[in-house]
């Protein structure tokens, strides 16, 4: 959940590409402004996954969250976090 | 802000070497299995996309970065 | 310049079908998914069905489910939405839309279920 | 499934007028949202996406903001053109919802 919160729109093509649904993909793509030879490449990743099937998807998408739960990822959330009310504190 | 190993994770998915990309999956989970599936995705990508598609992956991901919603 | 325009649409009786098509041009048609939106006479705009780019995927509202299909043919640039076990509430001139916000919209084709 | 309101459901103004039309949905739908006008018998006209991004043609009299769940369009100087059916609508995610639209007519 914490992953999400620091880049939705990252998760949300991630997700769209791994999961092999093409209409979720346009969607995502769309929120992106993507261009139409931005929207082939895109979809040339996807098809990669949708080859490997679904166990693929879920080794992929398992890489992604251990990635973005990692500490090297939670530390700098943590890190950000004591910025931010840093800079709320001093801002009162 | 995306996580800079998130950002290094996709940067070496589409620009690295499969070496390279296994590599980095390694670092995070090093399991025989999900190794093989980094490398099944990563050769298969580099045979999908020439250098014009990988710019323009690239593209979209400067475009989710630079996005308010990151 | 992007252009879709509709056809299909007519006089059908409770219970019968009709394929409505939407003819696209000005664009690279498989690049984007397509859209269905009905207009019920003197009502506002609902969503229908929704069709990926290379069609593997698609989405329909639950008042249409089971009964309508959407469906496209690249070669030809057209959209399709095949409508069975048509009832009076789907009475309405359907609008084929190109994005998801919408951006570009046929003229619309009106279909009457009556008896 | 995201319900989407509109407010207010019908409003009379003179040409010249500022108006203003909020839209309202029922989760957060962070920018995902568009705007349009529709004239009797005529096919919506999309005016706005992103929630405050202009459709290329659109005049700049017609401006949107907000994000999250509450949304405004904004009419500078209404013209007569403009007396039309104004209609919300998300694509935050599936099923796309639009409002129940907004009747500006002449007062």
């Known amino acids: 959940v914490k992953m999400a919160e620091t880049c939705p729109i990252f998760y949300d093509v991630f997700f769209a590409v791994a999961n092999g649904n093409e209409l979720l993909l346009d969607l995502s793509l769309t929120k992106v402004n993507a261009t139409e030879p931005e929207r082939t490449a895109m979809k040339k990743i996807q098809d990669c996954y949708v080859e490997n099937g679904l166990i693929s998807r879920v080794l992929d998408g398992l890489v992604m969250t251990t990635i973005s739960s990692s500490k090297d990822c939670m530390g700098e959330a943590v890190q950000n976090t004591v910025e931010d009310l840093k800079l709320n504190t001093l801002g009162r | 802000e995306i996580c800079p190993a998130v950002k290094r994770d996709v940067d070496l998915f589409l620009t690295g070497t499969p070496d390279e990309y296994v590599e980095q999956v390694a670092q995070y989970k090093a399991l025989p299995v999900v190794l093989e599936n980094a490398r099944i995705l990563k050769n298969c990508v580099d045979a999908k996309m020439t250098e014009e598609d990988k710019e323009n992956a690239l593209s979209v991901l400067d475009k989710i970065y630079t996005s308010p919603l990151c | 310049e992007v252009q879709l325009v509709e056809s299909g649409g007519g006089l059908v009786q409770p219970g019968g079908s009709l394929r409505l098509s939407c003819a696209a041009s000005?664009?690279?048609?498989?690049?984007?998914?397509m859209h269905w939106v009905r207009q019920a006479p003197g009502k506002g705009l609902e969503w229908v069905s929704s069709i990926s780019g290379r069609g593997r995927n698609s989405d329909h509202a639950d008042s249409v489910k089971g009964r309508f299909t959407i469906s496209r043919d690249n070669s030809k640039n057209t959209l399709y939405l095949q409508m069975n076990s048509l009832r009076a509430e789907d009475t309405a001139v359907y609008y084929c839309?190109?994005?998801?916000?919408?951006?570009?919209w046929g003229q619309g084709t009106l279909v009457t279920v009556s008896s | 499934d995201i319900q989407m309101t509109q407010s207010p459901s019908s409003l009379s103004a003179s040409v010249g007028d500022r108006i203003t039309i909020t839209c309202r949905a029922s989760q957060d739908i962070n920018n995902y949202l568009a705007w349009f006008q529709q004239k009797p018998g005529k096919a919506p006209k999309s005016l706005i996406y992103?929630?405050?991004s202009l459709q290329s043609g659109v005049p700049s009299k017609f401006s949107g903001s907000g994000s999250g769940t509450d949304f405004t369009l904004t009419i500078s100087s209404l013209q007569p053109e403009d007396f039309a059916t104004y209609y919300c609508q998300q694509y935050s995610s599936y099923p796309f919802t639009f409002g129940p639209g907004t009747k500006v007519d002449i007062k």
């Open positions: 992103g929630a405050s």
């Open positions: 839309a190109r994005t998801e916000y919408f951006h570009h």
């Open positions: 000005g664009f690279t048609f498989s690049t984007y998914a």
